[in-house]
Amino acid sequence: DTHKSEVAHRFKDLGEEHFKGLVLVAFSQYLQQCPFEEHVKLVNEVTEFAKTCVADESAENCDKSLHTLFGDKLCTVATLRETYGEMADCCAKQEPERNECFLQHKDDNPNLPPLVRPEVDVMCTAFHDNEATFLKKYLYEVARRHPYFYAPELLFFAARYKAAFAECCQAADKAACLLPKLDELRDEGKASSAKQRLKCASLQKFGDRAFKAWAVARLSQKFPKAEFAEVSKLVTDLTKVHTECCHGDLLECADDRADLAKYMCENQDSISSKLKECCDKPLLEKSHCLAEVENDEMPADLPSLAADYVESKDVCKNYAEAKDVFLGMFLYEYARRHPDYSVMLLLRLAKAYEATLEKCCAAADPHECYAKVFDEFQPLVEEPQNLVKQNCELFEQLGEYKFQNALLVRYTKKVPQVSTPTLVEVSRNLGKVGAKCCKLPEAKRMPCAEDYLSVVLNRLCVLHEKTPVSEKVTKCCTESLVNRRPCFSALELDEAYVPKAFNAETFTFHADMCTLSEKEKQVKKQTALVELVKHKPKATKEQLKGVMDNFAAFVEKCCKADDKEACFAEEGPKFVAASQAALA
């Protein structure tokens, strides 16, 4: 399906609004430090150029690839070397190396100030004064902070952002209407970004076979009534979409995602009974709805897998003839029977089955060798089941904040070399699994919990790759995608770690503590907790609890004092001394 002008093709397919939005996202994800106005100028230039190509596909440069056009445009930025340093060297390369170079310089933790939310009236005025600029600013600010955000999904978030302002800026109580909606968009956006980051890591670090295996398992759980051939077709198309988005090919990605949504809605009968309500919606909403659709009901009478995958005399023959197809069918059959398993567990089971066939199909009596293969699955299944049970019990006992603290201690002891902000961020997010998953019925707990943990641990891996400090983290992150979570779970106290020297400055607090939001206070306390564990990795739970209780009491006391700063100055050193004594 070749076109004389790729840029004209995509402009016509996507329409001007989506075209401009996606180009802005692409540029903002590549050049994360550039000012908004610079990006808007570049986008307008690209859009004008695209229009000339729509008018005449044979016009000069219209035959160039999108990477060439976009890369040339990015390389016109005057301050590239001053702002980005060695990323400017990318511009000396030819495509496709230049694009690969830009991709490698995407920064998962850019040094950008946290977004501050202005007063509601200020936001509503800005929205009414220039709606288009207001929405572009949203795309820009999110995209530069989340350089792997799923671009067509970000357009959907922007549409919801626009709808929230359109509705709430006319409401009697603007704040009561708007703020909960913005909070929801922020939280959903962070979750969406993290989920997409795992997809990109899967493709980039482990290859498309790993991503396809993930997709077979997940789509088979979602669409258990669909035939294997149908699931395979969806997996192939979905892999193409995500490969494009993760590779910075956002126009192609959005176009192909729209095609996939169209195909699914035209073929609902052979996919799932749950697609109907999604398919009546407009494009962005439809694609989002299809991606989030609930699992269809399992067919009534699915037979055991033993006949085809253990008892059949043709197991090794079928495996040898087409290994990936045979394993894909095994994964499909297993996953459609087990929506109660995490995708990662299903992939571990497929891996174990593959390893058994590799060994047994070379043995003297293959059938005798693999006859008990399913028995070997039991411990693999019970490990995450037990983990979820234990951690949900702990969450119910402690509540979210103290559960996060337990995880902070646990993970700091495992990998104390990791930076404190990273440990705090990751452990806080690990702790959110409780509220998210533990309230669910038994059959939904494991898929919710383990697949969420995989997303959070990928964030740790991505941050650690940028600044590697722990061989144990590197090992867990790189050896096996499906075994990352069990690898981290299995880590014990790092005996080789030399405790961090005590630094009183780390435990010095001021009156500004009192004006912080509850969340910010928690982060401060959790930062101190990590530093305590780094100083005394062998401290007991009781010792740490004692210090943290004293800390909370000290902060509460000083925040109630008339002269807060004087209180912190006087009581702070006492708290530090008492803490050191308690941990001695």
């Epitope: 699915l302 055991s304 033993a306 029977r337 087990h338 699955f377 039991q378 299944v381």
Partner: nanobody
Framework: QVQLVESGGGLVQPGGSLRLSCSAS????????MGWYRQAPGKQRELVAS???????HYADTVKGRFTISRDNSKNMVYLQMNSLRAEDTAVYYC?????????WGQGTQVTVSS
């Protein structure tokens, strides 16, 4: 070794009720399907009702609205509540539990609906 034992069958008048129970002894893990089947004299065994791991229930058209299947995961038990029984419900009722590694059947319990 897994063994399934059905109970609760017996003789009942048309319009009456029975509750069948099936318990699994032995180690059976990873159950994805629990079902009740029946076989009347001279007929094929047929699915009456099943419940899958996601909680989906399925019923034969002839029993819809009269029979209810339920389970207790923690005890590996499956039940069949049968109301408004008819003469044509007379059969041996079998319990079936499946995991990926096998299909496990009970010995059956006789249900006779007669006045």
């Amino acid at each position: 070794q897994v063994q399934l034992v059905e109970s609760g069958g017996g003789l009942v008048q048309p319009g009456g009720s029975l509750r069948l129970s099936c318990s699994a002894s032995g180690s059976i893990w990873g159950i994805y399907h629990m079902g009740w089947y029946r076989q009347a004299p001279g007929k094929q065994r047929e699915l009456v009702a099943s419940i899958t791991v996601d909680g989906s229930t399925h019923y034969a058209d002839t029993v819809k609205g009269r029979f209810t299947i339920s389970r207790d995961n923690s005890k590996n038990m499956v039940y069949l509540q049968m109301n408004s029984l008819r003469a044509e419900d007379t059969a041996v009722y079998y319990c079936d539990i499946r995991n990926v590694g096998g299909d496990y059947w009970g010995q059956g319990t006789q249900v006779t609906v007669s006045s």
